[in-house]
Amino acid sequence: QTSVSPSKVILPRGGSVLVTCSTSCDQPKLLGIETPLPKKELLLPGNNRKVYELSNVQEDSQPMCYSNCPDGQSTAKTFLTVYWTPERVELAPLPSWQPVGKNLTLRCQVEGGAPRANLTVVLLRGEKELKREPAVGEPAEVTTTVLVRRDHHGANFSCRTELDLRPQGLELFENTSAPYQLQTFVLPATPPQLVSPRVLEVDTQGTVVCSLDGLFPVSEAQVHLALGDQRLNPTVTYGNDSFSAKASVSVTAEDEGTQRLTCAVILGNQSQETLQTVTIYSFPAPNVILTKPEVSEGTEVTVKCEAHPRAKVTLNGVPAQPLGPRAQLLLKATPEDNGRSFSCSATLEVAGQLIHKNQTRELRVLYGPRLDERDCPGNWTWPENSQQTPMCQAWGNPLPELKCLKDGTFPLPIGESVTVTRDLEGTYLCRARSTQGEVTRKVTVNVLSPRYE
């Protein structure tokens, strides 16, 4: 009778095992083992027992011991079960960002592993088991569906294989896939709110504000603000579930025209975008041109107002005739025109908005000097010893220098309070002098003596 020890073995793939073939008869004609495995006989004294080292066991095998005794031939099989952990335990790739409320399918693939009867596949969220199934097929595939919730944000999903060889006196062998970290998000269907000037003048700065509510997680939201090809650099302020992105925008002459202002909010693998058109315009203040800013009295003066080709101007409140970007007026300069303001107002329509610009120029009229009766009376009669202020105002532009002298030497103190004496009496020659010329006027001062009773 042939016997084999051990009759059942579980061993790691590629491992070795010692198998003892024995026979009950003392002098067997033959004792050996039949196996395709590499084998070594580990010699022992005696004839009724042989020990073989079977090596590089890659798959389940059934070596057979045989013996040939006087009472006949017999055999005994040993059952070698190979175990090995899976070569691949993998979660099918998924986008890391998943919208809240979506059904997420987790798919675990397991390649290899034996014995399959002892191999289980477990899908997990953190340490919580979602599904447990035996490994079936090659590759084995286990799937489960998860309804994505807000509180799943940052959760690790993984797949674990359990090769449980504890019933065979071995251990529980576990293999775990690389974790899949779920990032959940909520991006509302409403587009972001974009507040910006509809029109913007070249070489000025404007402020753009983009905001959106109902985001999760708001800190992960990316905000892209752009005007045409110009990326803006916003300062973003976050609320619990909202943000507000504020950016300054500067425009140059190159940007003139209609530009597209974009605010895009990207969260997870979704985005919401708001577009707005901004008209960039160039509108310099109108130009007021005087033939000469400073003219002599009586000179013909042309006042012109020129503005943007599409603007409409009014000059000193008078609209251009015909209505357009140019207006002018002609005048003969009088002293009354000195310091006169000529105001040009231009109006330009940009994207339905009326933009106003003004420019003012002042005319200087050179005239005089002038001494007239109203401002410099030719006759004064004052009681002796009274307090008087001699007044004589010379007019002209530039303002003339005025001197009043009696006999060419004695001055009349113009604009000063004096006590009237006999010395003050007489005729004075008042001379007003400026770059425009000179005028004279005689002024007589009469002093009334007091009556003595």
């Epitope: 010692l18 070594k40 006989e41 580990l42 010699l43 022992l44 004294p45 020990v51 080292e53």
Partner: antibody, heavy 116, light 107 residues
Framework: EVQLVESGGGLVQPGGSLRLSCAAS????????IHWVRQAPGKGLEWVAR????????IYDPKVQGRFTISADDSKNTAYLQMNSLRAEDTAVYYC?????????WGQGTLVTVSS | DIQMTQSPSSLSASVGDRVTITCRAS??????LHWYQQKPGKAPKLLIY???QSISGVPSRFSGSGSGTDFTLTISSLQPEDFATYYC?????????FGQGTKVEIK
């Protein structure tokens, strides 16, 4: 009947070389493993080296690694131990023995004396 | 390397005595332990393999036990031909190592 016979021992100077032979009969050396075990005078047993004659895989005790080489010629059913750079502490009776994990059959041993 | 320590190093006993020799490994070696008997001027002889497996032709008074790190060779009734030196040997990992030996002498 399984039999192992060693030969090649003798007196050698330190730094010298010696080649021991182990002729096997009653079995095919390719079907098992051959080891060399030594015993210094009055001392215990010390495993030296092993060969798998089927594929010439070898393993050595770190004390002799690099100095000793175990080999086999399955056509002659003989194993060898080439000993180089011999030292006084290599003085011992060298046994060739067979089996895998235990040593079931031993030769009579050959004495190697390393001395100047 | 795994160290094998035998105790006692030597013992004196009388014919018929029960003799126990122990062997301790410096780390677990499962059952990969074998016992040998050596008489002066002779090659060692295998008595027990794999801690407890008997050998054809070896008297049944020799038995082995143990697993892990502690092993025992028992001679149930010492006979005159049993006076010799006994060695244990591990084959759990390379290099294979022997105990220092236990000499059994006549009392």
């Amino acid at each position: 009947e399984v039999q192992l016979v060693e030969s090649g021992g003798g007196l050698v100077q330190p730094g010298g070389s010696l080649r021991l032979s182990c002729a096997a009969s009653g079995f095919n050396i390719k079907d098992t493993y051959i080891h060399w075990v030594r015993q210094a005078p009055g001392k215990g047993l010390e495993w030296v080296a092993r060969i798998d004659p089927a594929n010439d895989n070898t393993i050595y005790d770190p004390k002799v690694q690099g100095r000793f080489t175990i080999s086999a010629d399955d056509s002659k059913n003989t194993a060898y131990l080439q000993m180089n750079s011999l030292r006084a502490e290599d003085t011992a009776v060298y046994y060739c023995t067979t089996s895998g994990y235990w040593f079931a059959y031993w030769g009579q041993g050959t004495l190697v004396t390393v001395s100047s | 390397d795994i160290q094998m320590t035998q105790s006692p190093s030597s013992l004196s006993a009388s014919v018929g005595d029960r003799v126990t020799i122990t062997c301790r490994a410096s780390q677990s070696i499962s059952n990969n332990l074998h016992w040998y008997q050596q008489k002066p001027g002779k090659a060692p002889k295998l008595l027990i393999y794999h801690a407890s497996q008997s050998i054809s032709g070896v008297p049944s008074r020799f038995s082995g036990s143990g697993s892990g790190t502690d092993f025992t060779l028992t001679i149930s009734s010492l006979q005159p031909e049993d006076f010799a030196t006994y060695y244990c040997q591990q084959s759990n990992s390379w290099p294979y190592t022997f105990g220092q030996g236990t000499k059994v002498e006549i009392k």
